[in-house]
Interface confidence: low
């Protein structure tokens, strides 16, 4: 096929004007998989444009996408997950541009959740834990996680730690004392599946302890009530006398 559409306003449009990108999410809704595509140029007039996927499907030759505002979306169990599918932008029966894509190489995991940070006073460290729905999945089970944290006042100075488990220990001495930190986590497929980073989890905020001259720490971190903190500080002052 030529690179030009043959109807009306679109007849001078070049293929490149319709470049798009897609990501898949496997077992995103029970046993259903999803595929989401969008045009890379936000100014494309999408009024009459449709997306269709053909090949590497179970029982059907092709499936049509639903249009949701600016994105195109399919939720189905019909992805074979072996071999490449042909994804086309269509106007009527005419294909404007197509891409051959193996859906297992464009997987975007679901965002991690339940991120929390607990301070261990005896160990002088912070235990970071989070959860991921992928632990229960059949396909995309193995993920690499990217934990990012920063001192709240440092706008762009994020420290990143990559890990394959859902638990991380941050040593207190590596963090600034009496500082508020923001932490978040995202995931990417590892092992057989390939693809993109998930969305970031919601951020979690925690405070590091102050360093006191004699007794070392005060409880000025985490969700501790002001009354307990005041009692603790009185106790520390009495110890100093």
């Amino acid at each position: 096929e030529s690179g030009y559409a043959q109807n009306g306003d679109l007849e001078d449009a070049e293929l490149d004007d319709y470049s798009f990108s897609c990501y898949s999410q496997l077992e995103v809704n029970g046993s259903q998989h999803s595929l989401t595509c969008a045009f890379e140029d936000p100014d494309v007039n999408i009024t009459n444009l449709e997306f269709e996927i053909c090949g590497a499907l179970v029982e059907v030759k092709c499936l049509n996408f639903r249009k949701l505002q600016e994105i195109y979306f399919i939720e189905t169990k019909k992805f074979l997950l072996i071999g490449k599918s042909n994804i086309c932008v269509k106007v009527g029966e005419k294909s404007l541009t197509c891409k051959k894509i193996d859906l297992t190489t464009i997987v975007k995991p679901e965002a991690p959740f339940d991120l929390s940070v607990v301070y261990r006073e005896g160990a002088n460290d912070f235990v970071v834990t989070f959860n991921t729905s992928h632990l229960q999945k059949k396909y995309v089970k193995v993920l690499m996680h990217d934990v990012a944290y920063r001192q709240e006042k440092d706008e762009n100075k994020w420290t990143h730690v990559n890990l394959s488990s859902t638990k991380l220990t941050l040593l207190q001495r590596k963090l600034q004392p009496a500082a508020m930190y923001e932490i978040k986590v995202r995931s990417i497929p590892d092992h057989y599946f390939k693809g993109f980073w998930s969305e970031w989890s919601p951020s979690y905020y925690f405070r590091t302890p102050e360093i006191n001259n004699s007794s070392g720490l005060s409880l000025s971190y985490g969700p501790v009530s002001p009354i307990i903190r005041r009692l603790w500080n009185i106790f520390v002052r009495n110890q100093e006398k």
């Epitope: 029970g30 046993s31 029982e59 189905t76 019909k78």
Partner: antibody, heavy 120, light 112 residues
Framework: QVQLQQSGAELARPGASVKLSCKAS????????ISWVKQRTGQGLEWFGE????????YYNEKFKVKATLTADKSSSTAYMELRSLTSEDSAVYFC?????????????WGQGTSVTVSS | DVVMTQTPLSLPVSLGDQASISCRSS???????????LYWYLQKPGQSPKVLIY???NRFSGVPDRFSGSGSGTDFTLKISRVEAEDLGVYFC?????????FGGGTKLEIK
């Protein structure tokens, strides 16, 4: 080839319950749903609901939600429908059918049907 | 619920004739994704239904090309170009666009 083997005919008293089974073979059981359909003698077809065995998610026709419970056993590739508080209105043939993603195939392969007779 | 009305109730035909069955829905069967989930099934005496046509006009695998489906919105038609003895039975239309899924009342195709 795809096959759905349903359990044998049931004779039940009013007020009792019955549990119908539907054993699937010839395809990956957890990759599809199982729908249940009712057909009274000489009458039309009514969709009861659908279960997705992998997740256990169920989707009922509200009309039959209190009448039926859908379950599935992945290890034996078998789906079940329990009918409770039986009345003469429940006397019918019940079919199970493989259902693809809700909006593509609906129900493509069907079991042979199980006859349920409610009589005192 | 979407009501599916089939006509005629009974259709006497001679072998080799063309047969046409109509199905009308109480609301549009065009899904929000642009597809129309209208199906046709054939149920022979003592058997379970078999799918003939999916999404208005697509023949299911193994279905002879004498069967064709057409229509849009709320009005749909199943045509059999040359009726054969094995085509006799009850034909049901079915919609999978709106939950609960619903069937038409059936059309019995019989020999004149």
């Amino acid at each position: 080839q795809v096959q759905l083997q349903q359990s044998g005919a049931e004779l039940a008293r009013p007020g009792a319950s019955v549990k119908l089974s539907c054993k699937a073979s010839g395809y990956t059981f957890t990759s599809y749903g199982i729908s249940w359909v009712k057909q009274r003698t000489g009458q039309g077809l009514e969709w009861f609901g659908e279960i997705y065995p992998r997740s256990g998610n169920t989707y009922y026709n509200e009309k039959f939600k209190v009448k039926a419970t859908l379950t599935a056993d992945k290890s034996s590739s078998t789906a079940y429908m329990e009918l409770r508080s039986l009345t003469s209105e429940d006397s019918a043939v019940y079919f199970c059918a493989r259902s693809g993603p809700p909006y593509y195939y609906a129900m493509d392969y069907w079991g042979q049907g199980t006859s349920v007779t409610v009589s005192s | 619920d979407v009501v599916m009305t089939q006509t005629p109730l009974s259709l006497p035909v001679s072998l080799g004739d063309q047969a046409s069955i109509s199905c009308r829905s109480s609301q549009s069967l065009v899904h929000s994704n642009g597809n129309t989930y209208l199906y046709w099934y054939l149920q022979k005496p003592g058997q379970s239904p078999k799918v003939l046509i999916y999404r208005v006009s697509n023949r299911f695998s193994g279905v002879p090309d004498r069967f064709s489906g057409s229509g849009s919105g709320t009005d749909f038609t199943l045509k059999i170009s040359r009726v054969e003895a094995e085509d006799l039975g009850v034909y049901f239309c079915f919609q999978g666009t709106h939950v609960p899924w619903t069937f038409g009342g059936g059309t019995k195709l019989e020999i004149k």
